[in-house]
């Protein structure tokens, strides 16, 4: 560290030689001692501070701030300025040393630039060829070639200075390819190195200001703008900065040439504008112009100066975003602020991280919107300096075109008993809910079948014309249709029912649901038979390994020869277009089934039983009955669907919650399985039982804790079990706030 002597004003270092110029002979030893009042350093010619082995700098033994510089066996190239200076100030003492060597009167300078001198055509500009002398009193002339020309100092425009070199107006040597200095000593001629003359070019390729897209600062901060110009080789440039406030100091402009790769075909120049402490007046466009004489190029950037750091949302920030399922969603954050804010996105209170489907940042991007993306998204802007925060909520609604639940579940070939009253159902899920659900009908024979594979289990028919159900002339009398809302599988659905008073004619019914994003429809084949009737026992859809039986009953006064068959795979259509209408024609290969006959007062009942129902038992079952009088065969078809056994799975995770004392916690345990699981709740691994504050609903699926107390805090576990195993979901409920003592307590 620098140590100064207290109470003493600082004086320049003193050298052991009192002269400004010192002349010594080559091969002798140069030794200069420097004394001062604080830490010292030496600099010697060619700017090599402490890097040359021949130069020795030693501490003096008798003085605290003293250093001696020694060079043994000096050579002509050691000629130059020797400078002793204080490390931390500009204060210095200099002696210029000539090392006289009449065999080499010229010394090489580091500014020689490998023997190249760049000149311009400026008549007034003086060029310096850096042939420095190891002696001050030489008679030096400048030789230029080709053609050969000699220039001698004239006491005016042409001169030689041992410390600088040969000065000459540039236009005098602009014709030359090379120049060198020459000195005559005792009739001997000595030459300096050869300097190649390069005439300056002028083409500017481009000028770039950085930062290019503008700068934002607050009052008092430092502004630094860089202007880079790329030019052809040998170009000289003038830089100029334009801005109203630049007329008034303080501003600092530093221009310099940048190093380029060896062999590069261009030069680079840099102009740096610095304003140490900006004011509002410094706001605006800054233009940098680079000028070479025969070319000017300019570029600009905008500087915005804010009164202080701030953050805010810009106008046009969306609050509600609606999109259809599958759409790409982009929600840009429109912000104002300095410096740029940190941006964080939360969904329903949870921090969002980018993944393969969602990207967060200046734009919230959801690559393919799904229903689960619906929710409230909060974007929080934080000023990195002041930590000021601003938040904005964006409600995202992912709209779903109407989906009709039964579409894939109900077989298109079920039959309905003549004269029976029937209820047809369409369960519609749509976001937003459907603005209408309408029912239409048409006689079976008026419709043809579609020949498209995709329609196999959905809409196998096309009808040229659909009639409104209110117009039931020639069809089945309709009692009416009604729409109800129901919470099914945790979703709000619309259940539309059509009541048919009496099944008299075979027809097709269509329900059509429409909402703002699309439409959905379901076609129901309503095939009426006067023949037997099929029922399933038990009536619920069977699961694997359960016992199920199909009953076929027919009036024994009308029918005989009841038979159960299973439709072979070839009898089922490969294409929907092959679906038979009416159902009982062309049934193809049938597999007859074992069955048991029962009778009651009016009917014969034929029962086929599946002891241990398997997925292989699924299919279309046909019951035949023969008319006693006409011997005509009648049939009815029933599709048997066997549900696959599935161990319970959690379909919606429980989420940790933080609640305040006295509030209500409501959670649902979403699990599916076949057979359906039974639900049990635990708190801190102890089974929960209902009491005044704890309510279990929907078969223990929903847990409600009313008037939350501090002791309700803990780990809650929902367990869903069936014969196939158990699954668990856990969540930790934190209860905040102090417990108030009640009068009761």
């Amino acid at each position: 560290a620098s140590v100064g002597l207290p109470g003493v004003s600082l004086e320049s270092p003193t050298l052991s030689t009192q002269k400004d110029i010192l002349t010594i002979m080559a091969n002798s030893t140069l030794q200069i001692t420097c004394r001062g009042q604080r830490e010292l350093d030496w600099l010697w010619p060619n700017h090599q501070s402490g890097s040359e082995e021949r130069v020795e700098v030693t501490e003096c033994s008798d003085d605290l701030f003293c250093k001696t510089l020694t060079i043994a066996k000096v050579i002509a190239n050691d000629t130059g300025a020797y400078k002793c200076f204080y490390q931390d100030t500009n204060m210095a003492s200099v002696v210029y040393v000539y090392v006289q060597d009449y065999r080499s009167p010229f010394i090489a300078s580091v500014s020689d630039q490998h023997g190249v001198v760049f000149i311009t055509e400026n008549k007034n500009k003086t060029m310096v060829i850096p042939c420095l002398g190891s002696t001050s009193n030489l008679n030096v002339s400048l030789c230029a070639r080709y053609p050969e020309k000699r220039f001698v100092p004239d006491g005016d425009k042409i001169s030689w200075d041992s410390k600088k070199g040969f000065s000459i107006p540039s236009y005098m040597i602009s014709y030359a390819g090379m120049v060198f200095c020459e000195a005559k000593i005792h009739d001997e001629t000595y030459q300096s190195i050869m300097y190649i003359v390069v005439v300056v070019g002028y083409r500017i390729y481009d000028v770039l200001v950085s930062p290019p897209h503008g700068v934002e600062l607050s009052v008092g901060q430092k502004l630094v703008l860089n202007c880079t110009a790329r030019t052809e080789l040998n170009v000289g440039l003038d830089f100029n900065w334009e801005h109203p406030s630049l007329k008034h100091p303080p501003k600092k402009v530093v221009n310099r040439e940048l190093k380029t790769q060896p062999g590069s075909e261009m030069k680079k120049f840099l102009s740096t504008l610095t304003i140490e402490s900006v004011t509002r007046a410094d706001q605006g466009w800054y233009i940098c112009a680079a000028s070479s004489g025969l070319m000017t190029k300019r570029n600009s950037t905008f500087v915005r100066v804010h009164e202080k750091p701030f953050v805010a949302f810009g106008s046009g920030m969306e609050s509600l975003v609606e999109a259809a399922v599958g759409a790409r969603i982009r929600v840009p954050v429109r912000w104002l602020g300095y410096p740029p804010p940190e941006i964080k996105w939360y969904k329903n209170g949870r921090l969002l991280e980018s993944n393969h489907t969602i990207k967060v940042g200046h734009v919230l991007t959801i690559s393919e919107a799904s229903e689960k993306d619906t929710g409230n998204y909060t974007v929080i802007l934080t000023n990195p300096i002041t930590r000021e925060k601003q938040s904005h909520v964006v409600s995202l609604v992912v709209n779903v075109p109407p989906q009709i639940g039964e579409k894939s579940l109900i077989s298109p070939v079920d039959s309905y008993q003549y004269g029976s009253s029937q209820t047809l159902t369409c369960t519609v899920y749509a976001v937003p809910p459907p603005h209408h659900i309408r029912w239409y009908w048409q006689l079976e024979e008026e419709c043809s079948e579609q020949a498209s594979q995709s329609a196999l289990m959905t809409n196998p028919y096309t009808c040229k014309e659909w009639r409104n159900v209110e117009d039931f002339q020639g069809g089945n009398r309709i009692e009416g249709s009604k729409n109800q809302f129901a919470l099914i599988e945790g979703k709000n659905k619309t259940v539309s029912t059509l009541v048919i008073q009496a099944a008299n004619v075979s027809a097709l019914y269509k329900c059509e649901a429409v909402n703002s994003v699309g439409r959905g429809e379901r076609i129901i084949s309503f095939h009426v038979t006067r023949g037997p009737e099929i029922t399933l026992h038990p009536s619920t859809q069977p699961t694997e390994q359960e016992t199920v039986s199909l009953w076929c009953s027919a009036d024994r006064t009308t029918f005989e020869n009841l038979t159960w068959c299973k439709l072979g795979p070839q009898a089922l259509p490969v294409h929907a277009g092959e679906l038979p209408v009416p159902v009982c024609e062309n049934l193809g290969a049938l597999a007859r089934l074992n069955a048991t006959v029962f009778s009651n007062s009016t009917n014969d009942i034929l029962i086929t039983e599946f002891q241990n129902a398997s997925l292989q038992d699924q299919g279309h079952y046909v019951c035949f009955a023969q008319d006693k009088k006409t011997k005509k065969r009648h049939c009815v078809v029933r599709q048997l669907v066997v549900l696959e056994r599935m161990a319970p799975v959690i379909t919606g995770s429980l989420e940790n919650q933080t609640t305040s004392i006295g509030e209500t916690i409501e959670v649902s345990c979403m699990a599916s399985g076949n057979p359906p699981p039974q639900f049990t709740w635990f708190k801190d691994n102890e089974m929960l039982v209902e009491d005044s504050g704890i309510i279990l609903k929907a078969g223990n699926q929903n847990l409600t804790i009313r008037r939350v107390r501090k002791e309700d805090e803990g780990l809650y576990t929902c367990q869903a079990c069936s014969v196939l195993g158990c699954v668990r979901a856990e969540a930790f409920f934190i209860v905040e706030g102090a417990q108030e003592k009640t009068n009761l307590e």
Epitope: Y202, D238, N240, S291, G293, M295, T296, R298
Partner: antibody
Framework: EVQLVQSGGGLVKPGGSLRLSCAAS????????MLWVRQAPGKGLEWVSA????????YYADSVKGRFTISRDNAKNSLYLQMNSLRAEDTAVYYC?????????WGQGTLVTVSS | DIQMTQSPSSVSASVGDRVTITCRAS??????LTWYQQKPGKAPKLLIY???SLQSGVPSRFSGSGSGTDFTLTISSLQPEDFATYYC?????????FGGGTKVDIK
């Protein structure tokens, strides 16, 4: 409006001198290189001299080197051409022009006639 | 110095004609070529720089092409105000040099 207005032309005897001026307005004069181009009667265009924005770099055509001097005063938004030792072949309309990627803005021209 | 040669030295054309003027450099100048238009008694006006870049405010019927030594100025549909003398100029090497000019007059 960006414009260059010239003055100073006229009739001069061989060996005489003349100083041409070019006043700039409508742009930041101090940022641009400027130049002079001349056109002898019925002939084509010939570049004469150029100067960089801060006068650091000056160029002359060989035909005028040593006789003509280009200069500028950025404070006055003015460009000058001092013509000495004039010859008959210097007779021409002299134009000043602003330099960007090319010579984009030109003065209206001023006629210099060198004749005895 | 680089010599610039224009051809033809004059061309007679009618309104609506397509006119092409060529300019050849004595050595390669990449795309450092400029075109000017000059009307009698007026100062030259910059049309095209860097061989093909149209100067702001110049009608799009003017276009430039070429690189190296051979360059072309094309007026796609000659208008009455286009009758003038056209000069090319190289900006590749010092000193800048102009072509001898091509006069476009009314047929």
């Amino acid at each position: 409006e960006v414009q260059l207005v010239q003055s100073g032309g006229g009739l001069v005897k061989p060996g005489g001198s003349l100083r041409l001026s070019c006043a700039a307005s409508g742009f930041t004069f101090s940022s641009y290189s400027m130049l002079w181009v001349r056109q002898a009667p019925g002939k084509g265009l010939e570049w004469v001299s150029a100067i960089s924005s801060s006068s650091s770099y000056i160029y002359y055509a060989d035909s005028v080197k040593g006789r003509f001097t280009i200069s500028r005063d950025n404070a006055k938004n003015s460009l000058y051409l001092q013509m000495n030792s004039l010859r008959a072949e210097d007779t021409a309309v002299y134009y000043c022009a602003r330099v960007t990627d090319a010579f984009d803005i030109w003065g209206q021209g001023t006629l210099v006639t060198v004749s005895s | 110095d680089i010599q610039m040669t224009q051809s033809p030295s004059s061309v007679s054309a009618s309104v609506g004609d397509r006119v092409t003027i060529t300019c050849r450099a004595s050595r390669g100048i990449d795309n450092w070529l400029t075109w000017y238009q000059q009307k009698p008694g007026k100062a030259p006006k910059l049309l095209i720089y860097e061989a093909s870049s149209l100067q702001s405010g110049v009608p799009s019927r003017f276009s430039g092409s070429g690189s190296g030594t051979d360059f072309t100025l094309t007026i796609s549909s000659l208008q009455p105000e286009d009758f003038a003398t056209y000069y090319c100029q190289q900006a590749k090497a010092f000193p800048p040099t102009f072509g001898g000019g091509t006069k476009v007059d009314i047929k």
